[in-house]
């Protein structure tokens, strides 16, 4: 893979976005589950 300085920072940004998306999905599921159980 390249050592490009633009790509490097964008790759880190994409990883952060993926983690945020995953966490939002997990937390969203938990919230829906909690509402269902009430």
């Amino acid at each position: 893979h390249s050592d490009g300085i633009f790509t490097d920072s964008y790759s880190r940004y994409r990883k952060q976005m993926a983690v945020k998306k995953y966490l939002a999905a997990v937390l969203g599921k938990r919230y829906k589950q909690r509402v269902k159980n009430k």
Epitope: H1, S2, I5, F6, T7, S9, Y10, Y13, R14
Partner: antibody
């Protein structure tokens, strides 16, 4: 030899379209972010847009909605599609490879002149 | 988009002079700054990346400093080959900020 060669420039009427090509040799373009930069006659450098290694694109406000950057990895070429051209788009257009943090250098094409005039 | 302001726009100097060019970002870009040299009819050439790291093959008389919003390019002892135009460029979070260049500084013979 590692190089970038632009082509496709020329004279076009206002409102017209043009597609510029940037052919890479000596390295695989697919691993790099590539940018387009333009320079109006006697003026400074203006960033036009970027295409990342995964194909994501981002544009300067002056290019948004009119210009599209794409890549064909099989041809080792990046393109700049320019639509609804205006007189103020007259410039030399350069493509460039992003700088490397270990190679510590960048790579630019020689530029291609686009003239928008009736 | 982040705006980059360079000063001065023109600088008259003599061989051997110490030359300083400044670049100001409209917001914090940390150390995500490039400096280029361009000669008439040629493509730009990278001098410095990450605000202060010298690019490959660039003479040590060139140096960069600064972070945040204020940056400086210094040529410690101007050589005949250094008469050219210099540009700074932001590359912090290009996906939201863009990658604007400064307006350029032309270094000419006094």
């Amino acid at each position: 030899e590692v190089q970038l060669v632009e082509s496709g420039g020329g004279l076009v009427q206002p409102g017209g379209s043009l597609r510029l090509s940037c052919a890479a040799s000596g390295f695989s373009l697919s691993s790099y972010a590539m940018i387009w930069v333009r320079q109006a006659p006697g003026k400074g450098l203006e960033w036009v847009g970027i295409i990342y290694d995964n194909g994501d694109t981002y544009y300067a406000s002056s290019a948004k909605g009119r210009f599209t950057i794409s890549r064909d990895n099989s041809k080792n070429t990046v393109y700049l599609q320019m639509n609804s051209l205006r007189a103020e788009d007259t410039a030399v257009y350069f493509c460039a490879r992003e700088p490397g943090s270990t190679t510590q250098n960048d790579l630019w094409g020689q530029g291609t002149l686009v003239t928008v005039s009736s | 988009d982040v705006q980059m302001t360079q000063s001065p726009s023109t600088l008259s100097a003599s061989v051997g002079d110490r030359v300083t060019i400044t670049c100001q970002a409209s917001e914090n870009i940390y150390n995500s700054l490039l400096w280029y040299q361009q000669k008439p009819g040629k493509a730009p050439k990278l001098l410095i990346y990450r605000a202060s790291t010298l690019a490959s093959g660039v003479p040590s008389r060139f140096s960069g400093s600064g972070s945040g919003t204020e940056f400086t390019l210094t040529i410690s002892s101007l050589q005949p080959d250094d008469f050219a135009t210099y540009y700074c460029q932001n590359y912090y979070n290009i996906w939201t900020n863009g990658a604007a260049f400064g307006g350029g500084t032309k270094v000419e013979i006094k």
